[in-house]
């Protein structure tokens, strides 16, 4: 039975040209996280494998940075980056957990930086 829950940074906004951290946190399960995939629609942004580390998709390599932790940092934001982002936690033995974040990239300086709530610091052990 899947008992875990994913907390995310929820709906966030950032300024064009700036950067933003996408964060998810899996809690309430003892399942082992084997891999976390970060996705935007049908695009794979990055994979964080528990054993092998990070792979950033070549299309995003110039403006996506791994971390902090299992999170992802998007840089040099454009208005086209507005949309839904997903963190997909592949776990054993539970299976897959999915978290959703909506990012709005704004032209002006009205963007709120940071999340609505603090994501707990997540130590990942191999």
């Amino acid at each position: 039975m899947m008992t875990g829950t994913i907390e995310t940074t929820g709906n966030i906004s950032a300024e064009k040209g700036g950067s933003i951290i996408l964060q998810c946190h899996l809690s309430s399960t003892t399942a082992q996280v084997t891999q976390v995939n970060w996705e935007q629609q049908d695009q794979l942004l990055a994979i964080c494998n528990a054993d092998l580390g990070w792979h950033i998709s070549p299309s995003f390599k110039d403006r996506v940075a791994p971390g902090p932790g299992l999170g992802l940092t998007l840089q040099s934001l454009t208005v086209n980056d507005t949309g839904e982002y997903f963190c997909i936690y592949h776990t054993y033995p539970d299976g897959t957990y999915t978290g959703r974040i909506f990012l709005e990239v704004l032209e002006s300086s009205v963007a709120e930086h940071g999340a609505r709530f603090q994501i707990p610091h997540h130590h990942h052990h191999h």
């Epitope: 995939n37 794979l44 592949h90 191999h126």
Partner: antibody
Framework: EVQLQESGPGLAKPSQTLSLACSVT????????WNWIRKFPGNKLEYMGY???????YYNPSLKSRISITRDTSKNQFYLQLNSVTTEDTATYYC??????????????WGQGTSVTVSS | DIVMTQSHTFMSTSVGDRVSITCKAS??????VAWYQQKPGQSPKLMIY???YRYTGVPDRFTGSGSGTDFTFTISSVQAEDLAVYYC?????????FGGGAKLEIQ
Amino acid sequence: EVQLQESGPGLAKPSQTLSLACSVTGYSITSDSWNWIRKFPGNKLEYMGYISYSGNTYYNPSLKSRISITRDTSKNQFYLQLNSVTTEDTATYYCARLDFSNYGGAVDYWGQGTSVTVSS
Amino acid sequence: DIVMTQSHTFMSTSVGDRVSITCKASQNVRTAVAWYQQKPGQSPKLMIYSASYRYTGVPDRFTGSGSGTDFTFTISSVQAEDLAVYYCQQYYTTPWTFGGGAKLEIQ
């Protein structure tokens, strides 16, 4: 340039343990991921598992109870052990390198392969 | 496990022709797909990764496309040396899995 060379017996009997070695030259196995993949008669490829740069292992769940991948960093070699083999394990076995950072799970260097027949 | 299906296991073509090999994933794998070429008597060679990126040294007549569940590997102008079996592979999640292969015959 990275080069991989498999070695081991070409023939095994049912219920025996199959042991293969992979010698790596031109690159240290303390970087990247080191993998075993096999090709069955009729062309089907199966990913078997890896040992990572840090020594962590992943095994295909279909083999999990029978497979072990180990390494000897002083010899720059890694090994496959497959227990309780049957005729279904007859295949060409490849050792291979995977540069996860650059290519994800795409395998960029392969050994020449070693043919293993399981027969009584 | 994710199943990668290459529906055409055998394809016949002529030198200079354009040929496309398709691969269908049993679930959405986004762009986490690679293509390999295995010539007779040789080990597989990586041709395409991340669905559409050519690996180092791969001639530009080879291209990959697709995302989600449907992927295509295309040779724009087939050469005699392209005689091989071509495999797709997904690495969206473990266990990484391969298609059954498509054998390309040059007439």
